[in-house]
Amino acid sequence: MMTGTIETTGNISAEKGGSIILQCHLSSTTAQVTQVNWEQQDQLLAICNADLGWHISPSFKDRVAPGPGLGLTLQSLTVNDTGEYFCIYHTYPDGTYTGRIFLEVLESSVAEHGARFQIP
């Protein structure tokens, strides 16, 4: 039975030209995490295999950095980076757990404005 849950950074926003860390955390399971895949909509960005390490897609190598931990850092953000990102945890014996993050990339002034007037 799959008992685990994935916690993510949820809905996040970042400035155009800046960078952002996408983070997921698997809890409430003793399953062995064998691999974590990071996807943007239908594109595979990176794979972190527990033993063989990080593998970054050549299409994203200039703008994606591994880590921290099992997370993924997106750099030099553009408005086109806005959208859904998924962390897919491959585990044994549970199977697959998926977490979702929505990233909105804003023009610099908009991002600053949004941060200044956040609802508590």
Epitope: N37, L44, N49, D51
Partner: antibody
């Protein structure tokens, strides 16, 4: 030049044990995860074990779990595969393999292989 | 486990021909597919990774592509040295698995 040299293969009776070795040179062995891949007489390839760079994490498919143990000695630049409770279906050529660089998804370096025959 | 099916165990071709070797995944593996070439008496050699990236030193007559669950290794003009076994491998999900192989032969 990267070199991987396997040894230790031979003829073993069903139920027996054997330990394979893979001597690595030409790269920083302690920085890379390593794998054992076998090729059965019908030419099928199967990944049988992986280990991370410091030996702290390992993975096995169900076909060998509990019977095979992968380990490494970074001081000696050597990878090992301890095999026990051997079955006729373990008869194969055993290769150690690795990859270099975070872009590479797959194994870009393989040894020449060592043959295991399980037969009475 | 993800199953990769290489439906042709053997493919016959003539030197200079264009040939396509196919591999079908039992479930989505995105672009996490590699192709290997194995000549008699040798260990496998990485040709293509991330479905379409050519490995260092691999001639540009070798091309990898993807269409949904179908992956293709194309050799634009077969040379004598290309006669070998070809395997696909997926790295999308553990355990990483291989196709059954396709042997490229001369007609």
């Amino acid at each position: 030049d990267v070199q991987l040299v396997e040894s230790g293969g031979g003829l073993v009776q069903p139920g027996g044990s054997l330990k394979l070795s893979c001597a690595a040179s030409g790269f920083t062995f302690s920085s890379y995860g390593m794998s054992w891949v076998r090729q059965t007489p019908d030419r099928r390839l199967e990944l049988v074990a992986t280990i991370n760079n410091n030996g702290g994490s390992t993975y096995y498919p169900d076909s060998v779990k509990g019977r095979f143990t992968i380990s490494r000695d970074n001081a000696r630049n050597t990878l090992y595969l301890q095999m026990s409770s051997l079955k006729s279906e373990d008869t194969a050529m055993y290769y150690c393999a690795t990859r270099t660089g975070t872009e590479i998804l797959g194994f870009d370096f393989w040894g020449q292989g060592t043959t295991l025959t399980v037969s009475s | 486990d993800i199953v990769l099916t290489q439906s042709h165990k053997f493919m016959s071709t003539s030197l200079g021909d264009r040939v396509s070797i196919t591999c079908k995944a039992s479930q989505d593996v995105s672009t996490a597919v590699a192709w290997y070439q194995q000549k008699p008496g040798q260990s496998p050699k990485l040709l293509i990774y991330w479905a379409s990236s050519r490995h260092t030193g691999v001639p540009d007559r070798f091309t990898g592509s993807r269409s949904g669950p179908d992956y293709t290794l194309t050799i634009s003009s077969v040379q004598a040295e290309d006669l070998a076994l070809y395997y696909c491998q997926q790295q999308y999900s553990t355990p990483w698995t291989f196709g059954g192989g396709t042997k490229l032969e001369i007609k």
